[in-house]
């Protein structure tokens, strides 16, 4: 693993992909999505210590300034680097349709 | 302003572009950047309350799950939606060069 992928806080503590099982009610979609009624939501969760999965130079700057001014500048934050598409079946005026959403499920994560 | 741009926490408290004055020493660049010696770093800072500048549907999901499971799922986080380029003058093996960096300065912000 690259240095940027080794978590100094211990296994599973740093920014990574997590799967959260959720119902449509949990997601607030119960009234417009027919199926599936349960979803495996992949999202990015975890800490972003120095040099861990830094997305770009902005993330490096942010970490350096956070060290200097922790009350002013927050640490970088764990967010999706890319997304997986997902299909939802929903009601339409004419009946029922399969709809693709490209920005629902995180595919991989980095620190920004 | 759209509803998603009105901060319910009070002016300036929610996710927005901030400018932080920093020296090359602050940024950890003193040994490889010649100029400028000081930089106005634009970055995204602030809270991401419900429906505020949500980047996409993933951000909506994250907020809904954060409300249900705050100990497991963090709130969405304020990150750059796009970047402004910046030119740095740096030392090279052969002398000095102008180098453009596309991912240094946040241009605008959203919640993911």
């Amino acid at each position: 693993a690259r240095n940027g992928d080794r978590c100094p806080l211990g296994p599973g503590r740093c920014c990574r992909l997590h799967t959260v099982h959720a119902s449509l009610e949990d997601l607030g979609w119960a009234d417009w999505v027919l199926s599936p009624r349960e979803v495996q939501v992949t999202m990015c969760i975890g800490a972003c210590p120095s040099q861990f999965r830094e997305a770009n130079m902005h993330a490096q700057i942010k970490m350096n300034l956070h060290r200097l001014k922790p009350d002013t500048v927050p640490a970088p934050c764990c967010v999706p680097a890319s997304y997986n598409p997902m299909v939802l079946i929903q009601k339409t005026d004419t009946g029922v349709s399969l709809q693709t959403y490209d920005d629902l499920l995180a595919k991989d994560c980095h620190c920004v | 302003a759209r509803n998603g741009d009105r901060c319910p926490l009070g002016p300036g408290r929610c996710c927005r572009l901030h400018t932080v004055h920093a020296s090359l020493e602050d940024l950890g660049w003193a040994d490889w950047v010649l100029s400028p010696r000081e930089v106005q770093v634009t970055m995204c800072i602030g809270a991401c309350p419900s429906q505020f500048r949500e980047a996409n549907m993933h951000a909506q999901i994250k907020m809904n799950l954060h409300r249900l499971k705050p100990d497991t799922v963090p709130a969405p986080c304020c990150v750059p939606a796009s970047y402004n380029p910046m030119v740095l003058i740096q030392k090279t093996d052969t002398g000095v060069s102008l180098q453009t960096y596309d991912d240094l300065l946040a241009k605008d912000c959203h919640c993911v």
């Epitope: 027919l34 599936p36 299909v87 029922v96 399969l98 | -």
Partner: antibody
Framework: QVQLVQSGAEVKKPGASVKVSCKAS????????INWVRQAPGQGLEWMGW????????NYAQKLQGRVTMTTDTSTSTAYMELRSLRSDDTAVYYC????????????WGQGTMVTVSS | DIQMTQSPSSVSASVGDRVTITCRAS??????LAWYQQKPGKAPKLLIY???SLQSGVPSRFSGSGSGTDFTLTISSLQPEDFATYYC?????????FGGGTKVEIK
């Protein structure tokens, strides 16, 4: 484990109706839809339609519209497919299958029910 | 309706051979393509979903690729139990449609 168990083989006369059942177990029945797919002897797979066990909403293949009705009984976790005005070319194995899921997957299939239409 | 065209309709191969089956959609279907294996008298079995994701329990010699309109199923080293008919299926929109099938036979 997740299972779909279908009713037994049927022999019907032309013009009659048939109702095939599909009992689900091993998962929350209302969380997924059920597709019905048929396969005539020696032929490929033909999608007939879909029903959500949650609300009863359906989507039927155009060519079967008016002849097919799909229903569910959530109390018994069972889906039903009724086909009316049977013709000899309706002779086929009829399958129920769960899905599509969030990745458009139709993942679990029943064992199939042979329906023969013959005078 | 989206038409799914599979080729070849049949292929003769030996154990250990690499077999490739292609499927073309009449319009873009993103990555919403699945591959099924069917043996005589049995229900279809899901092998690959979302174009390239291997269904749990399916051997890794099966792989899928493609997006948009052109998709491929590859069996890297054919095993005796792989002789069967293979179908592609799109679930990008209703009606869901299947390819005509590819029969993999023993040479």
């Amino acid at each position: 484990q997740v299972q779909l168990v279908q009713s037994g083989a049927e022999v019907k006369k032309p013009g009659a109706s048939v109702k095939v059942s599909c009992k689900a177990s091993g998962y929350t029945f209302t969380s997924y839809g059920i597709n019905w797919v048929r396969q005539a002897p020696g032929q490929g797979l033909e999608w007939m339609g879909w029903i959500t066990a949650y609300s009863g909403d359906t989507n039927y293949a155009q060519k079967l519209q008016g002849r097919v009705t799909m229903t569910t009984d959530t109390s018994t976790s069972t889906a039903y497919m009724e086909l009316r005005s049977l013709r000899s070319d309706d002779t086929a194995v009829y399958y129920c299958a769960r899905g599509p899921g969030q990745y458009a997957d139709v993942d679990v299939w029943g064992q199939g029910t042979m329906v023969t239409v013959s005078s | 309706d989206i038409q799914m065209t599979q080729s070849p309709s049949s292929v003769s191969a030996s154990v250990g051979d690499r077999v490739t089956i292609t499927c073309r959609a009449s319009q873009g279907i993103s990555s919403w393509l699945a591959w099924y294996q069917q043996k005589p008298g049995k229900a279809p079995k899901l092998l690959i979903y979302a174009a390239s994701s291997l269904q749990s329990g399916v051997p890794s010699r099966f792989s899928g690729s493609g997006s948009g309109t052109d998709f491929t199923l590859t069996i890297s080293s054919l095993q005796p139990e792989d002789f069967a008919t293979y179908y592609c299926q799109q679930a990008s929109q209703f009606p869901i449609t299947f390819g005509g099938g590819t029969k993999v036979e023993i040479k």
